[in-house]
Interface confidence: medium
Amino acid sequence: FERTRSLQDPCSNCPAGTFCDNNRNQICSPCPPNSFSSAGGQRTCDICRQCKGVFRTRKECSSTSNAECDCTPGFHCLGAGCSMCEQDCKQGQELTKKGCKDCCFGTFNDQKRGICRPWTNCSLDGKSVLVNGTKERDVVCGPSPADLSPGASSVTPPAPAREPGHSPQ
């Protein structure tokens, strides 16, 4: 018995979660365990992503959708679909080739990822430093010195570091 080929590809009738099995006369077969097809008309099912090591499973694989991974505590996702996990640092630090390093004087990072950035130069806007910067926080700029009432004082901003070498976002 020779199967008559219709004008329409018979595989187009196979729904998501199945594949068009050439070994079984183009019958729609369910995806095997640990595989999926997210669209209809597929001739193969894709292998499910496995979240191993520093990756952990955020969403289990199903017959119609791939698994989704995120990162274990102490790491954060990078890349489309969390393709990589990168080490967290503490606030006040940034990740360098040699690991987490404290922000240099005059720079800060208020996140667990990203880079250390120079403190804002309040004087550029004609303002004064209201609150000093730290490794974890930018300075807070206040009114210009001329706006301060007599007797009021303002913290003197430190000289800018000549090597901001560290910076985040």
Epitope: E86, I115, P118, Q169
Partner: antibody, heavy 121, light 109 residues
Framework: EVQLVQSGGGLVQPGGSLRLSCAAS????????MNWIRQAPGKGLEWLSY????????YYADSVKGRFTISRDNAKNSLYLQMNSLRAEDTAVYYC??????????????WGQGTLVTVSS | SSELTQDPAVSVALGQTVRITCQGD??????ASWYQQKPGQAPVLVIY???NRPSGIPDRFSGSSSRNTASLTITGAQAEDEADYYC????????????FGTGTKVTVL
């Protein structure tokens, strides 16, 4: 689709002013640091300034410090560069660029189309 | 003068391999990102970090890093790879925050 669409370039006399705009779409603008980068005719890329996602942290290259002002309006998904006291050496194509961080490096993952600023009398 | 130094120009035969280097003190601590720029167009990110490619960038582009040098390698160069390539990292002085390399013109023969 992420898009950065620039406007505001043109011809200006030395000592004059110009304001460049960069309209963002296709992403959550308020989540990202934004940058301005320029390229003089036939020359390489020069980084000019960044502004933090909320607008509170700003940094400038020495070449434009005190003359250029970067700002943003997150409600309008827009980035701006106010350029004052323009000089002939400021003639360049100006790009806005979205900044991201990954793999222990800073990256400019999306760029505007560029806008030409010509400073000449 | 830029703090990231690149060779001004290199040429490569179609289908062969070319390596572009970028040298600078800041690269001892930080990885570079790499940008391709064709005439009249905005730059496009091709490599960042140790060796990460944004989606849509062909796998013939790869990156590596050693001491104060970052490298971009194009394995099996295609005609459409002819462009200027710039590295970028942080500055090691306070004059700029980010700095671009001087740029390398890649010609595919």
């Amino acid at each position: 689709e992420v898009q950065l669409v620039q406007s505001g370039g043109g011809l200006v006399q030395p000592g004059g002013s110009l304001r460049l705009s960069c309209a963002a779409s296709g992403f959550t603008f308020s989540d990202y640091y934004m940058n301005w980068i320029r390229q003089a005719p036939g020359k390489g890329l020069e980084w000019l300034s960044y502004i933090s996602s909320g607008g509170s942290t700003i940094y400038y290259a020495d070449s434009v410090k005190g003359r250029f002002t970067i700002s943003r309006d997150n409600a309008k998904n827009s980035l701006y560069l106010q350029m004052n006291s323009l000089r002939a050496e400021d003639t360049a194509v100006y790009y806005c660029a979205r900044e991201d961080y990954g793999g222990n490096s800073v990256l400019f993952d999306y760029w505007g189309q560029g806008t030409l600023v010509t400073v000449s009398s | 003068s830029s703090e990231l130094t690149q060779d001004p120009a290199v040429s490569v035969a179609l289908g062969q391999t070319v390596r572009i280097t970028c040298q600078g003190d800041s690269l001892r601590s930080y990885y570079a990102s790499w940008y391709q720029q064709k005439p009249g167009q905005a730059p496009v990110l091709v490599i960042y970090g140790k060796n990460n490619r944004p989606s849509g960038i062909p796998d013939r582009f790869s990156g590596s890093s050693s001491r104060n040098t970052a490298s971009l390698t194009i394995t099996g160069a295609q005609a459409e790879d002819e462009a200027d390539y710039y590295c970028n990292s942080r500055d090691s002085s306070a004059n700029h925050f980010y700095v671009f390399g001087t740029g390398t013109k890649v010609t595919v023969l």
